[in-house]
């Protein structure tokens, strides 16, 4: 049957019917339902929510809804032995202790099982020593400390402010610098927007608020004990000493009231420049150690958290395709939260719930999508993207043969200013065309398209008249699908104004104050931004699952490949002498990119002209489009990161959240002037150029005429 025969409404009306069925009021109701108690991964509460979602998705009309479970390594504080940090005097007496919990928000005082702030997967330990302030603990911050200021962090406890980069990268950098412990804190400069009140009177972080989060460096491995394979009942598990990505030094997060107490006594070197100074009334001295009369005082960490293998549950719903049931379009977002999950993840889960309900309504009226749609409620995302990764590992053979696209659905909002999209270039045209058809929810843009308000508020830095679309990095559940399996992926959410709000993430991220009321009172009272995000995510899924020809444009990959080749070449040309000495040439890569450009244009011409009524031809062309993303996968993976296999994109080695283009070449070039053996280092650059060249050329060939 053709797609239109599988339905009693015409295709154009289907999309409209689907979008019209999405209701802000329902999203609001679902968000409220999902945020009344904590849903920490591995807990009974989160298992119950999984069963509730399973039951409701069945009611909504999906063909099947299953729970899939895995036994993965999770981490929890010791309930009887709390984690804290103290300042101790020369006699070893604790003269200051950090708080043991966040003051709960009004109305939530009697809620049980609020996990106190902790850094998940921190080892146990009670290191003591002098403090060194390391700014954001980025690679460049440690370069400044060690190379310019000649400050040695070896044997020291470092204190770093949250923001700019993924916290796991901060911990890794501190470990490499020889630190014995890490204290993470939220500086008001990053988590307190000027002119806005603290929660519960506004959306700013109070002094007692703390950001939880995992501090792993998994590099896409999933469960630390079963890298590459699902954590099922017969899985072989590594010992803790061989586990992937675990930190080796104790780590603990604190709020800015407690940080003030630690930082106000700091002595030693002054901060190198204003970029190292936050908004607290402290000198932001780097240390090491406390000043003058406090110089005999030390800092001591008391960390007693435990890591244990725990059962987690994904919910997987299926809406079978009428024409191509063996082609999967996946919409997935996580369900587990640190506490109430008012934004992360339940603002996303509520949107997924409403999308499922709308698809279910269409199905009940006799419609089916052309391709199969899979809906997923992932568990243990907060503990390292574990639920999605284990499921993808278990189903990797099916996914790499049948996976058309993955749309991520974590937090729907991180602000209420404009749209934010990260996706594969294959989806650029899909996103642009869809947003031109949707109405903007923004004030001052009544009757205008979402595309128009998005372009005005977030213009592309390179291409005028178009909105910005960013590269996919990681830190969310699309990682395994895109970076490991090469399935075309995208994500969309409403965001803040990055020009005027310099704070990192949103202030109450991963704190106890991330509640339903936060969203309902301050971010989206009418739930209009949630509705818009539902329309974008749902619209993308609809088009990917229902359009006769896949809505991918390979020409847009050609455009970005040219841009990325130019960029990496310009980076390498900062070393013209070495390029000459070691005969480093990018000619082959530029040639491959040109070939890709030419073949992509010819493919697009064939795509326009071929007989769409011929099912074999149609399937052939669609398969070439589906497998293009897959063609960028190197089965050997990136150096020391075997689960990051995409040659064009990978999470930055210095910030998991950010995407890097031509990551193999980029990493080979990074800090190359400091390498002990330049000949070997430039040899690796050449090797990476050859891998990139081969991959781009091979991807181009997949678009050539098949015979």
């Amino acid at each position: 049957k053709s797609s239109s025969e599988a339905t009693n409404i015409t295709p154009k009306h289907n999309m409209k019917a689907f979008l019209d069925e999405l209701k802000a009021e329902n999203i609001k109701k679902f968000l409220h339902n999902f945020t009344q108690i904590p849903h920490l991964a591995g807990t009974e509460q989160n298992f119950q929510l999984a069963k509730q979602i399973q039951s409701q998705w069945k009611e909504f009309g999906l063909d099947s809804v299953e729970l899939t479970h895995y036994d993965v390594l999770l981490s929890y504080p010791n309930k009887t032995h709390p984690n804290y940090i103290s300042i101790i005097n020369e006699d070893g007496n604790e003269i200051f202790n950090t708080s043991l919990f966040e003051p709960p928000p009004a109305g939530y005082e009697n809620v049980s099982d609020i996990v106190p702030p902790f850094s998940a997967f921190s080892p146990q330990g009670m290191p003591e020593g002098d403090l060194v302030y390391v700014n954001y603990a980025r690679t460049e911050d440690f370069f400044k400390l060690e190379r310019d200021m000649k400050i040695n962090c070896s044997g020291k406890i470092v204190i770093a402010r949250y923001g700019k980069v993924f916290r796991g990268n901060k911990v890794k950098n501190a470990q490499l610098a020889g630190a014995t412990g890490v204290i993470l804190y939220s500086d008001p400069d990053d988590y307190f927007a000027p002119g806005v009140k603290s929660y519960p009177d506004g959306w700013n972080l109070p002094g007692g608020g703390v950001q939880r989060g995992n501090i792993l460096n998994l590099n896409g491995a999933g469960d630390p004990l079963t890298p590459g394979y699902p954590a099922n009942e017969y899985a072989y598990r590594r010992g803790m000493a061989e586990a992937v990505g675990l930190p080796s030094i104790p780590v603990h997060p604190i709020g800015y009231y407690d940080a003030q107490k630690l930082l106000e006594k700091m002595g030693g070197s002054a901060s190198p420049d204003s970029s190292w100074r936050g908004s607290l009334k402290v000198p932001y001295n780097v240390g090491p150690g406390f000043t003058g009369n406090f110089s005999t005082q030390k800092v001591k960490m008391h960390i007693h958290s435990t890591s244990e293998v725990t059962r987690i549950y994904n919910v997987i719903g299926t809406l079978r395709g009428a024409v191509e049931p063996d082609r999967y379009v996946i919409l997935g977002g996580h369900r587990d939260s640190w506490v109430f999950g008012g934004i992360d993840p339940q603002s996303g889960a509520a949107v997924v719930h409403e999308i499922v309900r709308s698809f279910g309504m269409l199905k009940k009226e006799g419609w089916r999508p052309r391709r199969t749609i899979l809906f997923a409620s992932w568990d243990a995302e907060e503990f390292g993207l574990l639920g999605s990764t284990e499921w993808a590992e278990e189903n990797s053979r099916l996914l790499q043969e049948r996976g058309v696209a993955y749309i991520n659905a974590d937090s729907s909002i991180e602000g209420n200013y404009t749209l934010r999209v990260d996706c594969t270039p294959l989806m650029y045209s899909l996103v642009y065309n869809l947003t031109k058809e949707l109405e903007s929810p923004d004030e001052g843009f009544e009757g205008k398209s979402l595309y128009e308000s998005w372009t005005k508020k977030s213009p592309s830095p390179e291409f005028s008249g178009m909105p910005r679309i960013s590269k996919l990095g990681s830190g969310n559940d699309f990682e395994v699908f895109f970076q490991r399996l090469g399935i075309a992926s995208g994500r969309a959410r409403y965001t803040k104004n990055w020009e005027t709000n310099k704070f990192s993430s949103y202030p109450l991220y991963h704190s106890v104050y991330e509640t339903y009321e936060l969203v309902e009172k301050f971010y989206d009272p009418m739930f209009k931004y949630h509705l818009t995000v539902a329309q974008v995510r749902g619209g993308m899924v609809f088009e990917l699952a229902n359009s006769v020809v896949l809505p991918f444009d390979c020409r847009d990959y050609a455009v970005v490949l040219r841009k990325y080749a130019d960029k990496i070449y310009n980076i390498s040309m900062k070393h013209p002498q070495e390029m000459k000495t070691y005969s480093v040439s990018f000619d082959s890569l530029f040639s491959a990119v040109k070939n890709f450009t030419e073949i992509a244009s010819k493919f697009s011409e064939r795509l326009r002209d071929f007989d769409k009524s011929n099912p074999i031809l149609l399937r052939m062309m669609n398969d070439q489009l589906m497998f293009l993303e897959r063609a960028f996968i190197d089965p050997l993976g990136l150096p020391d990161r075997p689960f990051y296999r995409h040659v064009i994109y990978a999470p930055s080695s210095h910030n998991k959240y950010a995407g890097e283009s031509f990551p193999g070449i980029y990493d080979a070039l990074f800090d190359i002037e400091s390498k002990v053996d330049p000949s070997q280092a430039w040899g690796e650059v050449k090797r990476q150029i050859s891998i990139a060249t081969f991959t781009v050329q091979a991807a181009a060939e997949t678009l050539s005429e098949v015979a």
Partner: antibody, heavy 121, light 111 residues
């Protein structure tokens, strides 16, 4: 046979605006980058702007950035150049040119006959 | 001032050979493909050479192109009076993200 026909040139005062069009035929318009190249009287060629195939990413010469906007309508096989805040030094014959490779600019295998823009008070 | 440097003029007698140089930098000619265009008086430019050394169909093999390092050269053998024109080199510049041209070379066929 590939054809590119420019139109919309003329006399305009400094500070004024003009919109040039280029009607394309004989090839799959949407798959190729398109450029505007100009030539001041008695001078050499100067690339002005390009727009990629596909979604239409745009590129501009520094001399026109912020003043000129390139756009295309693939359904109409038409390329445009909106020129605002025109200056005397923008006086030139403006050529529309098709890329010979694909979605980004490499070389120009076909050129239009040109349209003259005169900026003068 | 053009990004690519060409001699303003060259001349030779009919039947002779002439070369026109085009000098750039590592970010343009050094890494990208060079094309050459012929502009006869009063007409639009015409593609003569692309991808450093390839000729479009219809361009006689008297015209040739080469590239070495950050320079490119257009060669014309068996000069004819009909070759009298302006010649431009062009390429992409990876630092500027822009197409760049040479200032043009006026070829005069003597006699």
């Amino acid at each position: 046979e590939v054809q590119l026909v420019e139109s919309g040139g003329g006399l305009v005062q400094p500070g004024g605006s003009l919109r040039l069009s280029c009607a394309a035929s004989g090839f799959t318009f949407s798959s190729y980058a398109m450029s505007w190249v100009r030539q001041a009287p008695g001078k050499g060629l100067e690339w002005v702007s390009a727009i990629s195939g596909g979604i239409g990413s745009t590129y501009y010469a520094d001399s026109v950035k912020g003043r000129f906007t390139i756009s295309r309508d693939n359904s109409k096989n038409t390329l445009w150049l909106q020129m605002n805040s025109l200056r005397a030094e923008d006086t030139a014959v403006y050529y529309c040119a098709k890329d010979g490779v694909g979605a980004t600019p490499y070389y120009f295998d076909y050129w239009g006959q040109g349209t003259l823009v005169t900026v003068s008070s | 001032q053009s990004v690519l440097t060409q001699p303003p003029s060259v001349s030779a007698a009919p039947g002779q050979k002439v070369t026109i140089s085009c000098s750039g930098s590592s970010s343009n000619i050094g890494i990208n493909y060079v094309s050459w265009y012929q502009q006869l008086p009063g007409t639009a430019p015409k593609l003569l050479i692309y991808d450093n050394n390839k000729r479009p169909s219809g361009i006689p093999d008297r015209f040739s192109g080469s590239k070495s390092g950050t320079s490119a050269t257009l060669g014309i053998t068996g000069l004819q009076t009909g070759d009298e024109a302006d010649y431009y080199c062009g390429t992409w510049d990876s630092s500027l993200s822009a197409v760049v041209f040479g200032g043009g070379t006026k070829l005069t066929v003597l006699g």
